[in-house]
């Protein structure tokens, strides 16, 4: 005869564990049902009756199967230097990431707690390492033969144009100025060469940060007298 399927609550066999989407309730000493994402345990199980689950209230959530007595509070609204990349729902927390031109100076489990503007390299300095979602721009002085005449978080040092006859030599913050209207070579594609050529700059836009999708763990959740419920193993 096939073994009968036990319905929750049931006493587990000695040495065995509860099944998927169940937890061992130490008070009842039974395997009981967990609550689905978006719900929480409103009434705990007994030896004869199962867990009663209820929906999370507005602005609260549970992301995993759980047996927590209260849902987690969603994080506060995103600040003006952030964009909401994931809304607060009953099953997921709000995620705020930094808007373009900013990076995350203080991260949290998902998204960013504190954004800061990307550093702008002043004239004479170029971007050595571009900013990322979580790191600031690194500037470096323009090496001899290169320059940057902008205050920018994206522009690198570029080579001076090479003149047949140099009117004004280039320096770290200024391109060379030629007397001839046709310099031998310009390293700036698309440059306009009228008496004193001015290079056009290509603008590098900061990629929009991708939201993290790691599951949250609730280190501040009331757990009841049993193993951690949110973020526990077993789905």
């Amino acid at each position: 005869l096939p073994a009968q399927v036990a319905f929750t609550p049931y006493a587990p066999e000695p040495g065995s564990t509860c099944r998927l989407r169940e937890y061992y309730d130490q008070t009842a000493q039974m395997c009981c049902s967990k609550c689905s994402p978006g719900q929480h345990a409103k009434v705990f199980c007994t030896k004869t009756s199962d867990t009663v689950c209820d929906s999370c209230e507005d602005s609260t959530y549970t992301q995993l199967w759980n047996w927590v007595p209260e849902c987690l509070s969603c994080g506060s609204r995103c600040s003006s230097d952030q964009v909401e990349t994931q809304a607060c729902t009953r099953e997921q927390n709000r995620i705020c990431t930094c808007r373009p031109g900013w990076y995350c100076a203080l991260s949290k489990q998902e998204g960013c707690r504190l954004c800061a503007p990307l550093r702008k390299c002043r004239p004479g300095f170029g971007v050595a390492r571009p900013g990322t979602e979580t790191s600031d721009v690194v500037c470096k002085p323009c090496a001899p033969g290169t320059f940057s005449n902008t205050t920018s978080s994206t522009d690198i040092c570029r080579p001076h144009q090479i003149c047949n006859v140099v009117a004004i030599p280039g320096n770290a913050s200024m391109d060379a100025v030629c007397t001839s209207t046709s310099p031998t070579r310009s390293m700036a594609p698309g440059a306009v060469h009228l008496p004193q050529p001015v290079s056009t700059r290509s603008q590098h836009t900061q990629p929009t940060p991708e939201p993290s999708t790691a599951p949250s763990t609730s280190f501040l959740l009331p757990m009841g007298p049993s193993p951690p419920a949110e973020g526990s193993t077993g789905d």
Partner: antibody, heavy 118, light 107 residues
Framework: QVQLVQSGAEVKKPGASVKVSCKAS????????IHWVRQAPGQGLEWMGW????????KYHEKFKGRVTMTADTSTSTAYMELSSLRSEDTAVYYC???????????WGQGTLVTVSS | DIQMTQSPSSLSASVGDRVTITCRAS??????LNWYQQKPGKAPKLLIY???RLHSGVPSRFSGSGSGTDYTLTISSLQPEDFATYYC?????????FGGGTKVEIK
């Protein structure tokens, strides 16, 4: 045997504050909520709020916000309820009660009578 | 806040009587209702939670039923130790609120 033992009776003047303690024993203090419920003389029961000692999260009845502070000392398994700006209508027996889920109270303290009188 | 109205506010009964106390909520509380017993000078004691679940150690003569807004506590055969005041309490919506109480007295 689960026990919640409260501090003794208090007499306070209007405008003063009172701090009532509730010492828990024979269960895991950090795994249960402690609620505070009061009962004016000859009247019904009124829920004031809760604290979860495991993470010190509190939830207060709107009526008492700004006047009530609930705290817990896990080292001594003691919960505290402080009520400030006392008035005569705060004269009541104050009970602490334990719950595992948030809404039903399975064990209660013996109560602390707080009298507010000029 | 959800208002809880108990009736009657008091009743007289004899040992052995079947006693019924009702509790009406001002809105649907979805079975999130508890019953407590309180004796003079003592703290309340949990009898029944979630409408009909008997708390451990509570005699089986106590039972609860109901749904929506209307709930009932029944004592099937009143015992001398049952003379007390009974309170209902909802835990559907914060703040948790109690009924005004029903005093069960000896006839």
């Amino acid at each position: 045997q689960v026990q919640l033992v409260q501090s003794g009776a208090e007499v306070k003047k209007p405008g003063a504050s009172v701090k009532v303690s509730c010492k828990a024993s024979d269960y895991s203090f950090t795994n249960y909520y402690i609620h505070w419920v009061r009962q004016a003389p000859g009247q019904g029961l009124e829920w004031m709020g809760w604290i979860y000692p495991g993470n010190v999260i509190t939830k207060y009845h709107e009526k008492f916000k700004g006047r009530v502070t609930m705290t817990a000392d896990t080292s001594t398994s003691t919960a505290y309820m402080e009520l400030s700006s006392l008035r005569s209508e705060d004269t009541a027996v104050y009970y602490c009660a334990r719950s595992r889920a948030t809404g039903y109270f399975d064990y209660w303290g013996q109560g602390t009578l707080v009298t507010v009188s000029s | 806040d959800i208002q809880m109205t108990q009736s009657p506010s008091s009743l007289s009964a004899s040992v052995g009587d079947r006693v019924t106390i009702t509790c009406r909520a001002s809105q649907d509380i979805r079975n999130y209702l508890n019953w407590y017993q309180q004796k003079p000078g003592k703290a309340p004691k949990l009898l029944i939670y979630y409408t009909s679940r008997l708390h451990s150690g509570v005699p089986s003569r106590f039972s609860g039923s109901g749904s929506g807004t209307d709930y009932t506590l029944t004592i099937s055969s009143l015992q001398p130790e049952d003379f007390a005041t009974y309170y209902c309490q909802q835990f559907n919506t914060l703040p948790w609120t109690f009924g005004g109480g029903t005093k069960v007295e000896i006839k």
